[in-house]
């Protein structure tokens, strides 16, 4: 790499993937291994993110861009940039501080992540329960009770209080 010739800042011409090396009279040196600079004119290269533990590499680091991580099987990403990995649970469960727990009666979770949510209260929309809910599935609401034969039930139990979902550190 040639020494830069900018009158204002000799570092301004150093391209992405290099840094302006003060130990070498401000010439543009390539980023060391496992580091990168995504913009020009940098005085240091940033060290690449290492995807370790429950993280795995989704995109390798290059001299101009950082590595990107996702999660190993059995875990899923949380937060922007996959800052954390959270344990998967089965459908019909939620993650608590004590691990995966079945949804309480009257609640469901149709995913491997997130919290159990209350079944839909069909009667709030003037409808009746067509298909009962389970731990894995919400109720299916049908026609309004007036359209049904006498004796049809439209009551769903209230959702019990639950411990909130937990993100393990």
């Amino acid at each position: 790499f040639e020494r830069t010739r900018s009158l204002q800042d000799p570092c301004s011409n150093c391209p992405a993937g290099t840094f302006c090396d003060n130990n070498r009279n401000q010439i543009c040196s390539p980023c060391p291994p496992n580091s990168f600079s995504s913009a020009g004119g940098q005085r240091t290269c940033d060290i690449c993110r290492q995807c370790k533990g429950v993280f795995r590499t989704r995109k390798e680091c290059s001299s101009t861009s950082n590595a990107e991580c996702d999660c190993t099987p059995g875990f899923h990403c949380l937060g922007a940039g996959c800052s954390m990995c959270e344990q998967d649970c089965k459908q019909g469960q939620e993650l608590t501080k004590k691990g995966c727990k079945d949804c309480c009666f009257g609640t469901f979770n149709d995913q491997k992540r997130g919290i159990c949510r209350p079944w839909t209260n069909c009667s709030l929309d003037g409808k009746s329960v067509l298909v009962n809910g389970t731990k894995e599935r919400d109720v299916v609401c049908g026609p309004s009770p007036a359209d049904l034969s006498p004796g049809a039930s439209s009551v769903t139990p209230p959702a019990p209080a639950r411990e909130p979902g937990h993100s393990p550190q």
Epitope: P33, N34, T44, D46, I47, C48, R49, Q50, K52, G53, T57, N66, L78, G79, A80, G81, S83, M84, S167, Q169
Partner: antibody, heavy 118, light 112 residues
Framework: QVQLQESGPGLVKPSETLSLTCTVS????????WSWIRQPPGKGLEWMGY???????NINPSLKSRVTISVDTSKNQFSLKLSSVTAADTAVYYC????????????WGQGTLVTVSS | EIVMTQSPLSLPVTPGEPASISCRSS???????????LDWYLQKPGQSPQLLIY???NRASGVPDRFSGSGSGTDFTLKISRVEAEDVGVYYC?????????FGQGTKLEIK
């Protein structure tokens, strides 16, 4: 270039809460982990915990019950709160940019001495 | 947590002479693709620590090439080929494989 600056009271009374803020300049707080590390006078370095700009945290188990770390992306700042302090918490407190979530602290603040005394 | 042990704890060196610091971890720091999660830091008197070496052997950008890191698994070495007066301070190794990251006790390098 990225610069970090710690700020907060230099003297805290025992049993009270220590509060420090780290202001990041010369770059965005986004896309990195941000750590707090402390050093008692004449002793070694202890990592306290990190926060990601999205708010995810990881705290050293030895301090977990007492430490809270938060982030304010609009101000490019992150903060440390350490509750129920004792004289053993007297230290220089550093904030640092953490490249991988618990590793390679490439940029450090200059540090601020916090003394716990009545 | 992983325990880091450094030796020696004190290192008097004559300027221009080489210096070597050893660091041992209680478990292997070797991870995928041969990457060792081991950093070296220098804390000069009255200053913040500065990163010298990451990944066991990668010199951080801007660090003079008289500094080099080597080793793998549990045994690592920081070498200074020719010590200069500005190299005085305390050198720390740190494992970055698991949280919490943990530091060695430090090695104080002083000029004879």
């Amino acid at each position: 270039q990225v610069q970090l600056q710690e700020s907060g009271p230099g003297l805290v009374k025992p049993s009270e809460t220590l509060s420090l803020t780290c202001t990041v300049s010369g770059g965005s707080i986004s896309s990195y982990y941000w750590s707090w590390i402390r050093q008692p006078p004449g002793k070694g370095l202890e990592w306290m915990g990190y926060i990601y700009y999205s708010g995810s945290t990881n705290i050293n188990p030895s301090l977990k019950s007492r430490v809270t770390i938060s982030v304010d992306t609009s101000k490019n700042q992150f903060s440390l709160k350490l509750s129920s302090v004792t004289a053993a918490d007297t230290a220089v407190y550093y904030c640092a940019r953490d490249q991988s979530g618990g590793g390679s602290f490439q940029h450090w603040g200059q540090g601020t001495l916090v003394t716990v005394s009545s | 947590e992983i325990v880091m042990t450094q030796s020696p704890l004190s290192l008097p060196v004559t300027p221009g002479e080489p210096a070597s610091i050893s660091c041992r971890s209680s478990q292997s720091l070797l991870y995928s693709q041969g990457y060792n999660h081991l950093d070296w830091y220098l804390q000069k008197p009255g200053q913040s620590p500065q990163l010298l070496i990451y990944g066991g052997s990668n010199r951080a950008s801007g660090v003079p090439d008289r500094f080099s890191g080597s080793g793998s698994g549990t045994d690592f070495t920081l070498k200074i080929s020719r010590v200069e007066a500005e190299d005085v301070g305390v050198y720390y190794c740190m494992q970055a494989l698991q949280t919490p990251p943990t530091f060695g006790q430090g090695t104080k390098l002083e000029i004879k």
